[in-house]
C-alpha cells in the first residue's frame, strides 16, 4: 500500500536501531572513502528527519522518495569531487538516473587498507566505552569494503560480533576467547559477501528472470514438499528482496525480508517441516537461519518426470502456451529430486531442456527430436561430479595450503596476464573449497563445491572487468553465469602468453618475512610461486615443487639464524641462482 511518507513508514517498520544501521550501511556502500564520523553525522541527520516525519507525515519533504532524500544528503557532502572524482557528476542527474549512477560507481576492490582487528584489550575497552559507536565502526568498515554486502545479513553479523564481545570481554583470557570466534564470523561474512555479489551480478547482467530461476532451483531443493505455486511465491518474494538490496534500497530490502520470514513461519505446513527452530528466534537470527535451513526430507515416492516433460504428446503445446511456467515447473520438478546437484548444474540442465524444445518444437516430428533430451543430460551431470572427485582427492592429498598452490599454478597458466595479487587472492579462495566442502557427506559435496567456486569466479570476473588483460578470462566472463565455472575449468595453458623476464628482485626476500603471521608468509610464498609460473608457464609440477621446497628450506634456515639479515643477503642470491637452474 502507498504511504504518505516512505521514510516514516520504514522507520516505524524497522525500529530506530535497524533503521540507523541500514542507513549507515547504505551511505558506506555508496561513498566508500568517507570516514566513519562523516557518515555517522549524515545518519544522525537522516534519523532526526525520519523522526519528524513519524511525528507528522505531512511535514516538509517527508513525501520525498528515499533515493531523493539519501541522494540529496550524499550530494551535499563537501569536497565530493576532490575525493570521488567523476562520481560527483551523478549529482547533476535527477532520480532515478542519479541512483543508477551511484550504483555504477560502487568499487568492488576499493583501495582501502585491510580491516585490521585491534588487540583484545583495546577492543574490549572501546566496546565497553561505547558499544553503539563500536558496532557502527564495524558496519562502516565492512560495508565500504563490500559495497554489495547483503545489508540485513550485515546487521546479523554485527549482532554476532556484539554477542561475542559481550561474552569474551568478561573473560580473563580475552584473546583466546575472541580470536577463534571472531575468525569464524569473519570467514562466514566473507563467504556471504561473495555469494551475495554473485546474486547481484546475476540480477545486473541477466535481469530478474535469471535470478528467479536461481531462486526456484534453490528453494525447490530446500523445500521439496512445497508445491510449485508455493515455490513460485517464495521465489518471487526473494527476487524482490534481492533486487532491492542489490539496487541500494536497503530499508525496503530489510523490511521485505522480515515480511518474507514472517510469511514462511506462518506457513510452515505448506513449506517445510524444518522451519520451527528458525522461527523461534528473534528477527535477524530468524531470517539468517531460514536462509541456510537444512533441506526438508524428500517425499518418498516422487515419480520420474519423463512422463510430463518428454513422453506427453502435449509437450510443445504446453511449452508454447506458457514458456516460463512450463520451464519453471521442469526446474522445480528436477531440483526437488536432486538436492545433490548444484544450482548451477540444475540451471544448465534447464537451459539445455529449453534449447532442445526451442529447436524440436519447430520440427516436423517434435517427440522424435526431444525424446532423448534427458539422456543427453548425462555428460552435463558427469562433468561437475568428476571435477569434485578430482579436486577433493587432490585436497585430501595436499591439505589446504598445498591445494591452494596447485590451483594457483593451474590458474596462472590459464591466465598469466592477470595481476599476481588477483591470482593469489583467487587461488587462496578457490583452495578453501576443499576445507569447506570436501569433508561433507557425498550428496552435499557437489552443490557446495560448484556453487562456491561460481561465486569466487564471479569475483575474478568483476576484478578483471576493471582492467581486462586476458582474452581467456574475458571469454569465460562474458558468457552466462552458469557456464563460467565449466569454462574456467576447461581453460588450458595460454599459448599466446610471452613469458615474463626473470627479475631477481621479485625473488629477493628480507628478514622481515620471519616475523609475519603465517597467513602473510603463505601469501609471500604464493606470490613468488605465481611469478615463477609467469616466468616459466610450462614448468612441470616437479620443477615447481623443487623450487618451492628449496624456498621453504631457505626461509626456515635464515629465520632460525642468529644473524638473519646476513643469512638473507648471502643465501638469497644463491637461492635465486638455484631457482633459475632448476627451471632452465
Amino acid at each position: 500500500e502507498a504511504h504518505k511518507s516512505e521514510i516514516a513508514h520504514r522507520y516505524n517498520d524497522l525500529g530506530e536501531q535497524h533503521f540507523k544501521g541500514l542507513v549507515l550501511i547504505a551511505f558506506s556502500q555508496y561513498l566508500q572513502k568517507c570516514s566513519y564520523d562523516e557518515h555517522a553525522k549524515l545518519v544522525q541527520e537522516v534519523t532526526d528527519f525520519a523522526k519528524t516525519c513519524v511525528a507528522d507525515e505531512s511535514a516538509a519533504n517527508c513525501d520525498k522518495s528515499l533515493h531523493t532524500l539519501f541522494g540529496d544528503k550524499l550530494c551535499a557532502i563537501p569536497n565530493l569531487r576532490e575525493n570521488y572524482g567523476e562520481l560527483a557528476d551523478c549529482c547533476t542527474k535527477q532520480e532515478p538516473e542519479r541512483n543508477e549512477c551511484f550504483l555504477q560507481h560502487k568499487d568492488d576492490n576499493p583501495s582501502l587498507p585491510p580491516f585490521e582487528r585491534p588487540e583484545a584489550e583495546a577492543m574490549c575497552t572501546s566496546f565497553k566505552e561505547n558499544p553503539t559507536t563500536f558496532m557502527g565502526h564495524y558496519l562502516h568498515e565492512v560495508a565500504r569494503r563490500h559495497p554489495y554486502f547483503y545489508a540485513p545479513e550485515l546487521l546479523y553479523y554485527a549482532e554476532q560480533y556484539n554477542e561475542i564481545l559481550t561474552q569474551c570481554c568478561a573473560e580473563a583470557d580475552k584473546e583466546s576467547c575472541l580470536t577463534p570466534k571472531l575468525d569464524g564470523v569473519k570467514e562466514k561474512a566473507l563467504v556471504s559477501s561473495v555469494r551475495q555479489r554473485m546474486k547481484c551480478s546475476s540480477m545486473q547482467k541477466f535481469g530478474e528472470r535469471a535470478f528467479k530461476a536461481w531462486a526456484v532451483a534453490r528453494l525447490s531443493q530446500t523445500f521439496p514438499n512445497a508445491d510449485f505455486a508455493e515455490i513460485t511465491k517464495l521465489a518471487t518474494d526473494l527476487t524482490k528482496v534481492n533486487k532491492e538490496c542489490c539496487h541500494g534500497d536497503l530499508l525496503e530490502c530489510a523490511d521485505d525480508r522480515a515480511e518474507l520470514a514472517k510469511y514462511m513461519c506462518e506457513n510452515q505446513a505448506t513449506i517445510s517441516s524444518k522451519l520451527q527452530t528458525c522461527c523461534d528466534k528473534p528477527l535477524l537470527k530468524k531470517a539468517h537461519c531460514l536462509s541456510e535451513v537444512e533441506h526438508d526430507t524428500m517425499p518418498a515416492d516422487l515419480p520420474a518426470i519423463a512422463a510430463d516433460f518428454v513422453e506427453d504428446q502435449e509437450v510443445c503445446k504446453n511449452y508454447a502456451e506458457a514458456k516460463d511456467v512450463f520451464l519453471g515447473t521442469f526446474l522445480y520438478e528436477y531440483s526437488r529430486r536432486h538436492p545433490d546437484y548444484s544450482v548451477s548444474l540444475l540451471l544448465r540442465l534447464a537451459k539445455k531442456y529449453e534449447a532442445t524444445l526451442e529447436k524440436c518444437c519447430a520440427e516436423a516430428n517434435p517427440p522424435a527430436c526431444y525424446g532423448t533430451v534427458l539422456a543427453e543430460f548425462q555428460p552435463l551431470v558427469e562433468e561437475p561430479k568428476n571435477l569434485v572427485k578430482t579436486n577433493c582427492d587432490l585436497y585430501e592429498k595436499l591439505g589446504e595450503y598445498g591445494f591452494q598452490n596447485a590451483i594457483l599454478v593451474r590458474y596462472t597458466q590459464k591466465a598469466p596476464q592477470v595481476s599476481t595479487p588477483t591470482l593469489v587472492e583467487a587461488a587462496r579462495n578457490l583452495g578453501r573449497v576443499g576445507t569447506k566442502c570436501c569433508t561433507l557427506p557425498e550428496d552435499q559435496r557437489l552443490p557446495c563445491v560448484e556453487d562456491y567456486l561460481s561465486a569466487i569466479l564471479n569475483r575474478v570476473c568483476l576484478l578483471h572487468e576493471k582492467t581486462p588483460v586476458s582474452e581467456h578470462v574475458t571469454k569465460c566472463c562474458s558468457g552466462s553465469l552458469v557456464e563460467r565455472r565449466p569454462c574456467f575449468s576447461a581453460l588450458t595453458v595460454d599459448e599466446t602468453y610471452v613469458p615474463k623476464e626473470f627479475k631477481a628482485e621479485t625473488f629477493t626476500f628480507h628478514s622481515d618475512i620471519c616475523t609475519l603471521p603465517e597467513k602473510e608468509k603463505q601469501i609471500k610464498k604464493q606470490t613468488a610461486l605465481a611469478e615463477l609460473v609467469k616466468h616459466k608457464p610450462k614448468a612441470t609440477a616437479e620443477q615447481l615443487k623443487t623450487v618451492m621446497d628449496d624456498f621453504a628450506q631457505f626461509l626456515d634456515t635464515c629465520c632460525k639464524a642468529a644473524d638473519k639479515d646476513t643469512c638473507f643477503s648471502t643465501e638469497g642470491p644463491n637461492l635465486v641462482t638455484r631457482c633459475k637452474d632448476a627451471l632452465a
Epitope: H295, T297, M298, A300, D301, L302, P303, A304, I305, A306, V310, E333, Y334, R337, H338, P339, D340, L374, A375, F377, Q378, V381, E382, P441, D443
Partner: nanobody, 115 residues
Framework: QVQLVESGGGLVQPGGSLRLSCSAS????????MGWYRQAPGKGLELVAS???????HYADTVKGRFTISRDNSKNMVYLQMNSLEPEDTAVYYC?????????WGQGTQVTVSS
C-alpha cells in the same frame, strides 16, 4: 538397457530374518530414489521402504523398526534387511530405482514367512 536383479528371497520361519539385494546393470545415472515394494497374493502393490538421494529413508508403518533399507552408491545396489518377519510379510518383493528419465523395476523375489 537397464536391468535390475533382486536376490535374497526365500522361505523363513516367523521371527526370522532375510536380507534382500538388488543390483542395477547397464547405464543408470542420476538416481534420486531407490525403493522396495511388495505385492501379496490378491493385494495391490505397496511401498515397503525407500531411500532418496539425500539419504532420507521412509518405511511403511507395518515394517517400521523391523526393516532397514540401505544402499551402496558406488555399485548402484540397494538392500533391505528384514528382521522379526511375520506371516503378513509374505509377498513378492520388487526393487525400484528411479532417475528423472524413468522408473526401473526388477522381476521380483518371493519371500514366504511360514512355520
Amino acid at each position: 538397457q537397464v536391468q535390475l536383479v533382486e536376490s535374497g528371497g526365500g522361505l523363513v520361519q516367523p521371527g526370522g530374518s532375510l536380507r534382500l539385494s538388488c543390483s542395477a546393470s547397464g547405464s543408470i545415472w542420476g538416481i534420486y530414489h531407490m525403493g522396495w515394494y511388495r505385492q501379496a497374493p490378491g493385494k495391490g502393490l505397496e511401498l515397503v521402504a525407500s531411500i532418496t538421494v539425500d539419504g532420507s529413508t521412509h518405511y511403511a508403518d507395518t515394517v517400521k523398526g523391523r526393516f532397514t533399507i540401505s544402499r551402496d552408491n558406488s555399485k548402484n545396489m540397494v538392500y533391505l534387511q528384514m528382521n522379526s518377519l511375520e506371516p503378513e510379510d509374505t509377498a513378492v518383493y520388487y526393487c525400484d530405482i528411479r532417475n528423472v528419465g524413468g522408473d526401473y523395476w526388477g522381476q521380483g523375489t518371493q519371500v514366504t514367512v511360514s512355520s
